[in-house]
Amino acid sequence: MRTEAQVPALQPPEPGLEGAMGHRTLVLPWVLLTLCVTAGTPEVWVQVRMEATELSSFTIRCGFLGSGSISLVTVSWGGPNGAGGTTLAVLHPERGIRQWAPARQARWETQSSISLILEGSGASSPCANTTFCCKFASFPEGSWEACGSLPPSSDPGLSAPPTPAPILRADLAGILGVSGVLLFGCVYLLHLLRRHKHRPAPRLQPSRTSPQAPRARAWAPSQASQAALHVPYATINTSCRPATLDTAHPHGGPSWWASLPTHAAHRPQGPAAWASTPIPARGSFVSVENGLYAQAGERPPHTGPGLTLFPDPRGPRAMEGPLGVR
């Protein structure tokens, strides 16, 4: 969900003007700028399909469009996982798949998408207006969730087009670790750009339509990303956006199995849309990550020696080794 802002094309100086060192120092800002642009805008899509053959059978597909590594996917129905929803399946990239009736078959389709077949009869049977949610816990983005359901008029065999992230939630995990490094890089980048502005401008290529111009524009940060550059370090994106089914592929587009969400151009958020929180104490990154697993009834992945995976009445020494073997 990246919006592209028109910013003046920053063109690098001609080779030889500032020498090899000058050229190298200008490569770094571009790399950092790219990281800043791509780091902050993951997206989750959800697609729900009722099977034509069995009216009580649904297929849910979810995907994560982000650069982070996925550590857990939770699929729930009846609402988001932490807000009254019931977990249907938990997919861990390393440990396997834990699923609850009426989930019949959950699978990884790719490294960033999953599918789940639901088959119900009686009380546990899904109905046409059920909301299905997918929550992706990833590093460094944090936890991102999207929900979708069949449109009321859906015929069996048709599907709702992919819903691009109606609910977006980045937990504290997403602003620590690598994000910290990126933010530091972004600050450093601004510093470099400011220095560059105050320096006597080197002779740039005069033509605005030079080959570098479109390339420079492609590097340009979105307004949302730019806003992120101006907010204090400890910010979390807690924006909730309504479902934008109309922005996805229309029914006349490619088949549902192959379809992917379009990048809907949402209004960029200004700093006011970001919630600022104090920087947590050292170690709370692990507890936040573990909270994601606890919500799904799961254990977090190995978090290193000496870290208790669940609260233990016997204190921090109660858990040592892979299974807490003493």
Epitope: P93, G96, Q105, P311, L323, G324, R326
Partner: antibody
Framework: QVQLQQPGAELVKPGASVKLSCKAS????????MHWVKQRPGQGLEWIGE????????NYNEKFKSKATLTVDHSSSTAYMQLSSLTSEDSAVYYC?????????????WGQGTSVTVSS | DIVMTQSPSSLAMSVGQKVTMSCKSS????????????LAWYQQKPGQSPKLLVY???TRDSGVPDRFIGSGSGTDFTLTISSVQAEDLADYFC?????????FGGGTKLEIK
């Protein structure tokens, strides 16, 4: 070392219920889901269900949903499985098993099993 | 549920011989996220509880002799005992640990001649 202790045998009448126990030691009880597995004489293994001792959350094989109820007692680090409305089909050895965090459904540590005989 | 089928149901071998037993699953056990196969092998000696030998199709559990070799991918898997020993007399079960509910094969009984 990890140990799962189960009583050796239970003799129960048809139609009655039995509550099997599995006492865990040598690891943090809340850190691993506890599984229960059925083995009828000379036959294969069937997974009954699992319970997360940290929050009591359960997950059952559909086949055993109305037969088995899984619970835990934190104070004694013990997992329980209650089997109801017993018939001769329920005569089997029942194992508890826990895993070492590598995969959800590898059963790394097993109890010795409780032999349940349903007979009048 | 994923159905696991083992063959042969029994076999008799002499000490030192190479043993292979097969396990087939009704659907692929390959996790497309990490290209791992979620299949385990267990050994159950007479009067004992099962013991984990191999998981992720080919990873030996700690303390398991290296004569036990797991292989295969997708739906077809094999457990090989490169040089069978008298203490290997047991039932061997394969199990998919891909998803709920985990399911076991019917077992292969290994007898020593």
């Amino acid at each position: 070392q990890v140990q799962l202790q189960q009583p050796g045998a239970e003799l129960v009448k048809p139609g009655a219920s039995v509550k099997l126990s599995c006492k865990a030691s040598g690891y943090t009880f809340t850190s691993s889901w506890m599984h229960w597995v059925k083995q009828r004489p000379g036959q294969g293994l069937e997974w009954i269900g699992e319970i997360n001792p940290s929050d009591g959350r359960t997950n059952y094989n559909e086949k055993f949903k109305s037969k088995a109820t899984l619970t835990v007692d934190h104070s004694s680090s013990t997992a329980y499985m209650q089997l109801s409305s017993l018939t001769s089909e329920d005569s089997a050895v029942y194992y508890c098993a826990s895993n070492a965090d590598r995969a959800y459904y590898t059963m790394d540590y097993w109890g010795q099993g409780t032999s349940v005989t349903v007979s009048s | 549920d994923i159905v696991m089928t083992q063959s042969p149901s029994s076999l008799a071998m002499s000490v030192g011989q190479k043993v292979t037993m097969s396990c087939k699953s009704s659907q692929s056990l390959l996790n497309s996220f990490n290209q791992r196969n979620f299949l385990a092998w267990y050994q159950q000696k007479p009067g004992q509880s099962p013991k984990l030998l191999v998981y992720f199709a080919s990873t030996r559990d700690s303390g398991v002799p290296d004569r036990f070799i797991g292989s295969g991918s997708g739906t077809d898997f094999t457990l090989t005992i490169s040089s069978v020993q008298a203490e290997d007399l047991a039932d061997y079960f394969c199990q998919q640990h891909y998803s709920t509910p985990p399911t076991f094969g019917g077992g292969t009984k290994l007898e020593i001649k």
